[in-house]
């Protein structure tokens, strides 16, 4: 396993609809054709997998149908979107990138993006 640099923003604020987007960029050390991207959430020293996708260079990023993540790839950067977020989902979201093929295998883990989610206030009842 060889190490690889990964960069991502330090902080992102989710929209009022519970959607957060951020870029994950990696320093590809060679001609990788198969890349796996995983989003991990760290909160209270617990790390859980949020979503993962494997893609071939030049093709779209495909997450499972029931995934809360969507994304697009362009060169050695991935634009990730996580939806359905609630205030309780606030935490550090870490981008993990693996160059699966061809060998050698490379692994890179970003420092994480702190995503803040604020639940919207319910609208007050209107007299109209």
């Amino acid at each position: 396993c060889k190490a690889m640099h990964v960069a991502q923003p330090a902080v992102v604020l989710a929209s009022s609809r519970g959607i957060a987007s951020f870029v994950c960029e990696y320093a590809s050390p060679g001609k990788a054709t198969e890349v796996r991207v995983t989003v991990l959430r760290q909160a209270d020293s617990q790390v859980t997998e949020v979503c993962a996708a494997t893609y071939m260079m030049g093709n779209e990023l495909t997450f499972l149908d029931d995934s809360i993540c969507t994304g697009t790839s362009s060169g050695n950067q991935v634009n990730l979107t996580i939806q359905g977020l609630r205030a309780m989902d606030t935490g550090l979201y870490i981008c993990k990138v693996e160059l699966m093929y061809p060998p050698p295998y490379y692994l890179g883990i970003g420092n994480g993006t702190q995503i803040y989610v604020i639940d919207p206030e319910p609208c007050p009842d209107s007299d109209f």
Partner: nanobody, 126 residues
Framework: EVQLVESGGGLVQPGGSLRLSCAAS????????VGWFRQAPGKEREELSC????????DYPGSVKGRFTISRDNAKNTVYLQMNSLRAEDTAVYYC???????????????????WGQGTQVTVSS
């Protein structure tokens, strides 16, 4: 859209040095990571080095580490490749390529670059 033009190639004796330049027009190069590649006749394109947008991150494959140095001057919209201790096997057409990125990293994979220069010929011979 950014356009790239390489210069600085030519004929050099073994053991000599050259500095290649990659000048950009049409856009500011500071928004782009830049890589240098070369292709010798009948061979695949080979990665040589890359540099991130700010210049703080660079990368080299083992084959040229210690002999080649990449740098950039964003004020001049130019990236440079300093090549020392040149050998006959360094003879090739040298290309620079650019990729618009958000952060400071760069890639050594030719697959990641979407804008390429026309190349400059480097010949190492006595």
């Amino acid at each position: 859209e950014v356009q790239l033009v390489e210069s600085g190639g030519g004929l050099v004796q073994p053991g000599g040095s050259l500095r290649l330049s990659c000048a950009a027009s049409g856009d500011t190069l500071e928004s782009f990571a830049v890589g240098w590649f070369r292709q010798a006749p009948g061979k695949e394109r080979e990665e040589l080095s890359c540099i991130g947008r700010t210049g703080e991150f660079t990368d080299y494959p083992g084959s040229v580490k210690g002999r080649f140095t990449i740098s950039r001057d964003n004020a001049k919209n130019t990236v440079y490749l300093q090549m020392n201790s040149l050998r006959a096997e360094d003879t090739a057409v040298y290309y620079c390529a650019a990729e618009r990125l958000v952060f400071h990293l760069c890639s050594l994979s030719e697959y990641d670059y979407d804008t390429w220069g026309q190349g400059t010929q480097v010949t190492v011979s006595s």
